[in-house]
Protein backbone atom coordinates (compact mmCIF):
# COMPACT_ATOMS: atom_id res chain seq x y z
CA UNK A 1 0.00 0.00 0.00
CA UNK A 2 1.21 3.50 -0.92
CA UNK A 3 0.70 5.78 2.09
CA UNK A 4 1.27 9.00 0.12
CA UNK A 5 -2.39 10.05 0.12
CA UNK A 6 -3.09 9.59 3.83
CA UNK A 7 -4.34 12.45 5.96
CA UNK A 8 -1.14 12.70 7.99
CA UNK A 9 -2.39 15.39 10.36
CA UNK A 10 -5.40 13.27 11.36
CA UNK A 11 -3.21 10.21 11.90
CA UNK A 12 -0.85 12.35 13.99
CA UNK A 13 -3.82 13.58 16.05
CA UNK A 14 -5.04 9.98 16.54
CA UNK A 15 -1.56 8.98 17.67
CA UNK A 16 -1.23 11.88 20.11
CA UNK A 17 -4.77 11.43 21.44
CA UNK A 18 -4.70 7.72 22.16
CA UNK A 19 -2.26 5.38 20.32
CA UNK A 20 0.77 6.89 22.09
CA UNK A 21 -0.81 6.16 25.49
CA UNK A 22 -1.44 2.51 24.53
CA UNK A 23 2.19 2.12 23.45
CA UNK A 24 3.33 3.53 26.81
CA UNK A 25 0.99 1.12 28.63
CA UNK A 26 2.42 -1.82 26.66
CA UNK A 27 5.95 -0.74 27.56
CA UNK A 28 5.21 -0.04 31.24
CA UNK A 29 7.89 -1.39 33.50
CA UNK A 30 10.53 -1.04 30.79
CA UNK A 31 13.25 1.63 30.96
CA UNK A 32 13.21 4.02 28.00
CA UNK A 33 16.98 3.46 27.58
CA UNK A 34 16.67 -0.34 27.49
CA UNK A 35 16.49 -0.65 23.69
CA UNK A 36 18.39 1.12 20.93
CA UNK A 37 16.40 2.43 17.99
CA UNK A 38 17.65 0.60 14.90
CA UNK A 39 14.69 1.20 12.56
CA UNK A 40 14.27 4.65 11.03
CA UNK A 41 12.14 6.36 8.39
CA UNK A 42 12.73 9.33 6.13
CA UNK A 43 9.29 10.86 5.54
CA UNK A 44 5.69 10.36 6.58
CA UNK A 45 4.67 7.77 3.95
CA UNK A 46 7.88 5.84 4.66
CA UNK A 47 7.24 6.03 8.42
CA UNK A 48 3.72 4.61 7.97
CA UNK A 49 5.13 1.82 5.80
CA UNK A 50 7.58 0.89 8.55
CA UNK A 51 4.94 1.27 11.28
CA UNK A 52 2.58 -1.02 9.40
CA UNK A 53 5.31 -3.60 8.85
CA UNK A 54 6.48 -3.66 12.49
CA UNK A 55 2.93 -3.63 13.87
CA UNK A 56 1.32 -6.29 11.69
CA UNK A 57 4.03 -8.54 10.25
CA UNK A 58 5.11 -11.41 12.54
CA UNK A 59 8.83 -11.46 13.30
CA UNK A 60 11.16 -14.00 14.88
CA UNK A 61 10.60 -13.88 18.61
CA UNK A 62 7.43 -11.77 18.39
CA UNK A 63 4.68 -13.73 16.69
CA UNK A 64 1.94 -11.10 16.74
CA UNK A 65 1.24 -7.63 18.05
CA UNK A 66 -1.89 -7.29 15.95
CA UNK A 67 -4.32 -7.96 18.81
CA UNK A 68 -2.79 -5.33 21.10
CA UNK A 69 -4.87 -2.20 21.62
CA UNK A 70 -2.29 0.10 19.99
CA UNK A 71 -2.26 -2.16 16.92
CA UNK A 72 -6.04 -2.24 16.58
CA UNK A 73 -6.15 1.54 16.84
CA UNK A 74 -3.32 1.89 14.32
CA UNK A 75 -5.20 -0.32 11.89
CA UNK A 76 -8.38 1.70 12.43
CA UNK A 77 -6.59 5.02 11.92
CA UNK A 78 -5.05 3.81 8.66
CA UNK A 79 -8.44 2.50 7.52
CA UNK A 80 -10.11 5.84 8.21
CA UNK A 81 -7.48 8.31 7.00
CA UNK A 82 -5.66 6.39 4.25
CA UNK A 83 -8.02 6.08 1.25
CA UNK A 84 -8.33 2.49 0.03
CA UNK A 85 -6.24 1.03 2.85
CA UNK A 86 -9.03 -1.24 4.16
CA UNK A 87 -9.46 -2.91 0.79
CA UNK A 88 -5.78 -3.83 0.59
CA UNK A 89 -5.90 -5.42 4.04
CA UNK A 90 -8.75 -7.92 3.55
CA UNK A 91 -6.53 -10.74 2.27
CA UNK A 92 -3.82 -9.98 4.82
CA UNK A 93 -6.36 -10.15 7.66
CA UNK A 94 -7.70 -13.51 6.47
CA UNK A 95 -4.17 -14.91 6.34
CA UNK A 96 -3.47 -13.58 9.83
CA UNK A 97 -6.58 -15.24 11.28
CA UNK A 98 -5.24 -18.63 10.17
CA UNK A 99 -1.99 -18.16 12.08
CA UNK A 100 -3.29 -16.34 15.15
CA UNK A 101 -1.36 -17.22 18.27
CA UNK A 102 -1.78 -16.71 22.00
CA UNK A 103 -0.78 -13.21 23.15
CA UNK A 104 2.62 -13.39 24.85
CA UNK A 105 4.71 -10.33 25.75
CA UNK A 106 8.29 -11.37 25.06
CA UNK A 107 11.41 -9.23 25.35
CA UNK A 108 11.56 -9.27 21.55
CA UNK A 109 8.03 -7.80 21.41
CA UNK A 110 9.02 -5.08 23.86
CA UNK A 111 12.01 -4.24 21.68
CA UNK A 112 9.76 -4.14 18.61
CA UNK A 113 7.29 -1.81 20.31
CA UNK A 114 10.17 0.40 21.40
CA UNK A 115 11.14 0.64 17.71
CA UNK A 116 7.51 1.51 16.92
CA UNK A 117 7.58 4.35 19.43
CA UNK A 118 10.64 5.74 17.66
CA UNK A 119 8.96 5.49 14.26
CA UNK A 120 5.85 7.26 15.53
CA UNK A 121 7.97 10.03 17.07
CA UNK A 122 9.74 10.44 13.74
CA UNK A 123 6.36 10.48 11.91
CA UNK A 124 5.31 13.38 14.14
CA UNK A 125 8.40 15.43 13.27
CA UNK A 126 8.57 15.21 9.46
CA UNK A 127 10.63 18.37 8.99
CA UNK A 128 13.54 17.16 11.10
CA UNK A 129 16.60 16.24 9.06
CA UNK A 130 17.62 12.57 9.23
CA UNK A 131 20.62 12.09 11.57
Amino acid sequence: YDFTNCDFEKIKAAYLSTISKDLITYMSGTKSTEFNNTVSCSNRPHCLTEIQSLTFNPTAGCASLAKEMFAMKTKAALAIWCPGYSETQINATQAMKKRRKRKVTTNKCLEQVSQLQGLWRRFNRPLLKQQ
Partner: nanobody, 132 residues
Framework: QVQLVESGGGLVQAGGSLRLSCAAS????????ITWFRQAPGKEREGVSY????????YYADSVKGRFTISSDNAKNTVYLQMDSLKPEDTAVYYC?????????????????????????WGQGTQVTVSS
Protein backbone atom coordinates in the same frame (compact mmCIF):
# COMPACT_ATOMS: atom_id res chain seq x y z
CA GLN B 1 -18.43 27.96 3.44
CA VAL B 2 -18.88 25.29 6.07
CA GLN B 3 -21.22 26.09 8.93
CA LEU B 4 -22.51 24.21 11.95
CA VAL B 5 -25.21 25.97 13.94
CA GLU B 6 -26.45 24.60 17.26
CA SER B 7 -29.78 25.50 18.84
CA GLY B 8 -32.18 24.23 21.49
CA GLY B 9 -30.20 24.92 24.65
CA GLY B 10 -31.71 26.56 27.70
CA LEU B 11 -32.48 26.30 31.38
CA VAL B 12 -34.31 23.19 32.55
CA GLN B 13 -35.02 21.53 35.88
CA ALA B 14 -33.39 18.25 36.86
CA GLY B 15 -35.35 15.36 35.35
CA GLY B 16 -36.47 17.49 32.42
CA SER B 17 -35.74 17.22 28.70
CA LEU B 18 -34.22 19.28 25.91
CA ARG B 19 -33.65 18.64 22.21
CA LEU B 20 -30.56 20.16 20.64
CA SER B 21 -30.22 20.65 16.89
CA CYS B 22 -27.10 20.98 14.76
CA ALA B 23 -27.79 22.37 11.30
CA ALA B 24 -24.97 21.80 8.82
CA SER B 25 -24.18 23.44 5.49
CA UNK B 26 -21.28 23.74 3.07
CA UNK B 27 -20.19 20.08 2.91
CA UNK B 28 -21.45 16.65 1.79
CA UNK B 29 -23.47 15.83 4.90
CA UNK B 30 -23.97 12.12 4.10
CA UNK B 31 -20.22 11.37 4.21
CA UNK B 32 -19.59 13.00 7.57
CA UNK B 33 -19.68 11.99 11.19
CA ILE B 34 -21.26 14.48 13.57
CA THR B 35 -20.39 14.35 17.25
CA TRP B 36 -21.84 16.29 20.14
CA PHE B 37 -19.27 17.49 22.66
CA ARG B 38 -19.80 19.39 25.87
CA GLN B 39 -17.62 21.57 28.03
CA ALA B 40 -18.39 22.52 31.61
CA PRO B 41 -16.56 25.46 33.23
CA GLY B 42 -13.00 24.49 34.16
CA LYS B 43 -13.29 21.08 32.52
CA GLU B 44 -12.02 19.56 29.28
CA ARG B 45 -14.29 19.20 26.29
CA GLU B 46 -15.78 15.69 26.31
CA GLY B 47 -17.45 13.58 23.65
CA VAL B 48 -21.13 12.96 24.36
CA SER B 49 -22.49 11.18 21.31
CA TYR B 50 -21.48 10.32 17.71
CA UNK B 51 -23.52 9.54 14.62
CA UNK B 52 -22.41 8.52 11.14
CA UNK B 53 -24.61 10.20 8.55
CA UNK B 54 -23.52 7.42 6.19
CA UNK B 55 -24.82 4.34 8.04
CA UNK B 56 -26.42 6.00 11.12
CA UNK B 57 -24.24 4.04 13.52
CA UNK B 58 -24.12 5.74 16.93
CA TYR B 59 -21.91 5.88 20.03
CA TYR B 60 -22.53 7.36 23.48
CA ALA B 61 -20.43 8.34 26.46
CA ASP B 62 -21.15 6.09 29.45
CA SER B 63 -22.41 9.09 31.43
CA VAL B 64 -25.34 9.68 29.03
CA LYS B 65 -26.20 6.15 27.87
CA GLY B 66 -29.90 5.44 28.23
CA ARG B 67 -30.72 9.14 28.70
CA PHE B 68 -29.55 10.82 25.49
CA THR B 69 -30.46 9.84 21.92
CA ILE B 70 -28.69 11.09 18.80
CA SER B 71 -30.37 11.04 15.39
CA SER B 72 -29.96 12.69 12.01
CA ASP B 73 -32.21 13.87 9.21
CA ASN B 74 -30.09 13.76 6.07
CA ALA B 75 -32.77 15.55 4.05
CA LYS B 76 -32.47 18.53 6.40
CA ASN B 77 -28.71 18.22 7.00
CA THR B 78 -29.46 18.29 10.71
CA VAL B 79 -28.39 16.18 13.68
CA TYR B 80 -30.43 16.09 16.88
CA LEU B 81 -29.55 15.28 20.48
CA GLN B 82 -32.58 14.34 22.56
CA MET B 83 -31.63 14.76 26.21
CA ASP B 84 -33.93 13.20 28.81
CA SER B 85 -33.66 12.71 32.58
CA LEU B 86 -31.27 15.64 32.72
CA LYS B 87 -29.00 16.02 35.74
CA PRO B 88 -27.22 19.09 37.14
CA GLU B 89 -23.92 17.52 36.01
CA ASP B 90 -25.14 17.77 32.40
CA THR B 91 -24.77 21.57 32.66
CA ALA B 92 -22.30 22.68 29.99
CA VAL B 93 -21.91 24.37 26.63
CA TYR B 94 -22.80 21.79 23.96
CA TYR B 95 -20.98 21.84 20.62
CA CYS B 96 -21.46 19.83 17.47
CA UNK B 97 -18.41 18.93 15.38
CA UNK B 98 -18.00 17.31 11.98
CA UNK B 99 -15.32 15.01 10.54
CA UNK B 100 -15.12 13.92 6.93
CA UNK B 101 -13.75 10.36 7.06
CA UNK B 102 -15.18 8.94 10.28
CA UNK B 103 -18.65 9.05 8.73
CA UNK B 104 -17.77 6.36 6.20
CA UNK B 105 -15.76 4.30 8.71
CA UNK B 106 -18.08 4.18 11.68
CA UNK B 107 -16.84 0.86 13.08
CA UNK B 108 -13.21 1.99 13.19
CA UNK B 109 -14.30 5.37 14.59
CA UNK B 110 -15.28 3.74 17.88
CA UNK B 111 -11.65 4.25 18.96
CA UNK B 112 -11.46 7.94 18.06
CA UNK B 113 -14.82 9.69 18.15
CA UNK B 114 -14.32 11.27 21.60
CA UNK B 115 -11.15 13.19 20.67
CA UNK B 116 -11.76 16.85 19.72
CA UNK B 117 -8.43 17.18 17.85
CA UNK B 118 -9.73 14.93 15.07
CA UNK B 119 -12.64 17.14 13.99
CA UNK B 120 -12.59 19.56 11.06
CA UNK B 121 -15.51 21.85 11.79
CA TRP B 122 -17.16 23.16 14.96
CA GLY B 123 -20.29 25.07 15.84
CA GLN B 124 -20.33 28.03 18.21
CA GLY B 125 -22.06 26.09 21.01
CA THR B 126 -25.35 26.27 22.91
CA GLN B 127 -25.64 26.58 26.68
CA VAL B 128 -27.51 23.90 28.64
CA THR B 129 -28.17 24.60 32.32
CA VAL B 130 -29.82 22.03 34.55
CA SER B 131 -30.97 23.33 37.91
CA SER B 132 -31.61 21.15 40.92
Amino acid sequence: QVQLVESGGGLVQAGGSLRLSCAASGFTFDDYAITWFRQAPGKEREGVSYISNNDHNTYYADSVKGRFTISSDNAKNTVYLQMDSLKPEDTAVYYCAAEGRMGTHSRESSYFWTFPALYDYWGQGTQVTVSS
